[in-house]
């Protein structure tokens, strides 16, 4: 849905001084039945890594067919491989399911590079390491694709968790999560803890590694430290939020905050990188280069192309700055900030140099479709998609990679004025957002 390293294709002005603080509404949100506490059966139900996406095991049909499904908060279709493909170990065989219903309708989803197309139907779906429920959900049976499935990724489909507005072929096709909430007592909320490896993994290690947790219907306290801070969902299509300020090592980028959200800012687990609008990307890279100026890295590194390798265990994390994004808070004129480390935005790559090396790609890239807070951001945090209250929560992830000197952070409140002006109003057109 976003081009660049968009899986599965692969990969305001500051306001008042930051010393001025506002009290929080409450230290803890009130208890709500089924929404908090322990969800032991769902912890560690994700596998994968940031470069190839995080997937959850799902079953489809009767008798159940098990498939690994990419968790994607940047799209809204539940789509699975339904025909042989060289990169698929297995696929959904509709003819073997007694509960499959054909909707007699096709769906075609083009990306900037690549596409998938298929046939719409419904079937019974459940998540073995999720809530103990079965739902009838819309399924796009992918019959043809190009540059969609990833060789060795170990997933066979995609679970689009965003809203109906961006579903294909149109918003009348109910997304999986809407069906789940309608048909069961599962609360309208899910949360994600994506755990980046922090070091390169070979194929066998990836298949055996734990990737994180998708908690369906609640929040698990064991997955985060500190407090959850919430930012409003600006509009229910993508998970759109508003960034009001950006800092590199505490230095404000000093851009008109509209630039940060041009033409939108979204939280997207299906994108590898932190993707920034052209002007913001250029300013951020200039600032990161300046902060790490004792070294010079190749031009292609900053483009996310060349790898830089250090002798194992000697990566100089300290020369790279932290990056802070300030998000609109729930209270008027109040914001909070999320801070990521180089351990999040330098993405470990399976060792292509020697076994004595740690190699990384720069995982911040340029976007023509707004800011995308992909796995690079999400791997630092426990992220709560509170659809019921139209907000997204961030807390420091219990599994984020850090060192002894610095840690990812979620801090607030900060006074920031005129935050509404930071949002960009996209002109209404009939053009597909998927094609941008």
């Amino acid at each position: 849905t976003q081009h660049g390293i968009r899986l599965p294709l692969r990969s305001g002005l500051g306001g008042a001084p930051l010393g001025l603080r506002l009290p929080r509404e409450t230290d803890e949100e009130p208890e709500e039945p089924g929404r908090r506490g322990s969800f032991v059966e769902m912890v560690d139900n994700l596998r994968g890594k940031s470069g190839q996406g995080y997937y959850v095991e799902m079953t489809v049909g009767s008798p159940p067919q098990t498939l690994n499904i990419l968790v994607d908060t940047g799209s809204s279709n539940f789509a699975v491989g339904a025909a042989p493909h060289p990169f698929l170990h297995r696929y959904y065989q509709r003819q073997l399911s007694s509960t499959y219903r054909d909707l007699r309708k096709g769906v075609y989803v083009p990306y900037t590079q690549g596409k998938w197309e298929g046939e719409l139907g419904t079937d019974l779906v459940s998540i073995p390491h999720g809530p103990n429920v079965t739902v009838r959900a819309n399924i796009a049976a992918i019959t043809e694709s190009d540059k969609f499935f990833i060789n060795g990724s170990n997933w066979e489909g995609i679970l689009g968790l965003a809203y109906a507005e961006i579903a294909r072929p149109d918003d009348s096709l109910e997304p999986f999560f809407d069906s789940l909430v309608k048909q069961t007592h599962v609360p309208n909320l899910f949360s994600l803890q994506l755990c980046g490896a922090g070091f390169p993994l070979n194929q066998s290690e990836v298949l055996a590694s734990v990737g994180g947790s998708m908690i369906i219907g609640g929040i698990d306290h064991s997955l985060y430290t500190g407090s959850l801070w919430y930012t409003p969902i600006r509009r229910e299509w993508y998970y759109e939020v508003i960034i009001v300020r950006v800092e590199i090592n505490g230095q404000d980028l000093k851009m008109d905050c509209k630039e940060y959200n041009y033409d939108k800012s979204i939280v997207d687990s299906g994108t590898t990188n932190l993707r920034l609008p052209k002007k913001v990307f250029e300013a951020a890279v200039k600032s990161i280069k300046a902060a790490s100026s004792t070294e010079k890295f190749p031009d292609g590194f900053w483009l996310g192309e060349q790898l830089v390798c250090w002798q194992a265990g000697t990566t100089p994390w300290n020369i790279f700055p932290v990056i802070s994004l300030y998000l609109m808070g729930e209270v008027t004129n109040q914001s909070f900030r999320i801070t990521i480390l180089p351990q999040q935005y330098l993405r470990p790559v399976e060792d292509v140099a020697t076994s004595q090396d740690d190699c990384y790609k720069f995982a911040i890239s340029q976007s023509s479709t707004g800011t995308v807070m992909g796995a690079v951001i999400m791997e630092g945090f426990y992220v709560v998609f509170d659809r019921a209250r139209k907000r997204i929560g961030f807390a420091v992830s219990a599994c984020h990679v850090h060192d002894e000197f610095r840690t990812a952070a979620v801090e607030g409140p900060f006074v920031t004025l005129d935050m509404e002006d930071c949002g960009y109003n996209i002109p209404q057109t009939d053009e597909s957002t998927l094609m941008t």
């Epitope: 004792t294 190749p298 060349q306």
Partner: antibody
């Protein structure tokens, strides 16, 4: 135009330290667009990257030589130097200094090279 | 470790003929590959960088192509001064420390 010139002894005894200097003329070594590197070539063989240095003093070394190599820079003299300790006959080679340009990825300007023989 | 394999080891041609040299990487190096020419008793000289860009002062008869794992250096019509050893070097994995073993272009 910019030129590089290696200098240093042509004969080094086994177990001693090989020391070479590269003098850059026609331009400043402190220009931030380049690394400055050393490459060697044993007689009749291929090229082997030794390491490189930025004007700030930041160094990168070939892992196979790292324990024996030191590269340093003297911006006031517009020079950078190579020291290779505990040499053996296998270190006999033509040693080249070079500028690493084109996005600090390729060796775009080379010195003429100097033959260093390790022998007692 | 990325290994660059050059072929053939020796290429025997006459002046005026077309020379095609190959460099194959053990894994993709994108387009981060260079070609160097080395004449006897001289230092190497950068010919091509980023797979297909000619370095300053390099004649148009030299051209580079390829991406990923397979690269080619073509000399469209050999001049007497082109008989030399040619090396490829990758810079996808940085620092740029990997050279191929070389191809010798000799007069037939």
């Amino acid at each position: 135009q910019l030129q590089l010139q290696e200098s240093g002894p042509g004969l080094v005894k086994p177990s001693e330290t090989l020391s070479l200097t590269c003098t850059v003329s026609g331009g400043s070594i402190s220009r931030g667009s380049y690394y400055w590197g050393w490459i060697r070539q044993p007689p009749g063989k291929g090229l082997e990257w030794i390491g490189m240095i930025y004007y700030s003093g930041s160094t990168w070394y070939n892992p196979s030589l790292k324990s024996r190599v030191t590269i340093s820079v003297d911006t006031s003299k517009n020079q950078f130097s190579l020291k290779l300790s505990s040499v053996t006959a296998a270190d006999t080679a033509v040693y080249y200094c070079a500028r690493v340009g084109h996005g600090v990825s390729y060796f775009d300007l080379w010195g003429r090279g100097t033959l260093v023989t390790v022998s007692s | 470790e990325i290994v660059l394999t050059q072929s053939p080891a020796t290429l025997s041609l006459s002046p005026g003929e077309r020379a095609t040299l190959s460099c194959r990487a053990s894994q993709s190096v994108s387009s981060y590959l260079a070609w160097y020419q080395q004449k006897p008793g001289q230092a190497p000289r950068l010919l091509i960088y980023d797979a297909s860009n000619r370095a300053t002062g390099i004649p148009a008869r030299f051209s580079g192509s390829g991406s990923g794992t397979d690269f080619t250096l073509t000399i469209s019509s050999l001049e007497p001064e082109d008989f030399a050893v040619y090396y490829c070097q990758q810079a996808y994995v940085w620092p740029p420390r990997t050279f191929g073993g070389g191809t010798k272009v000799e007069i037939k």
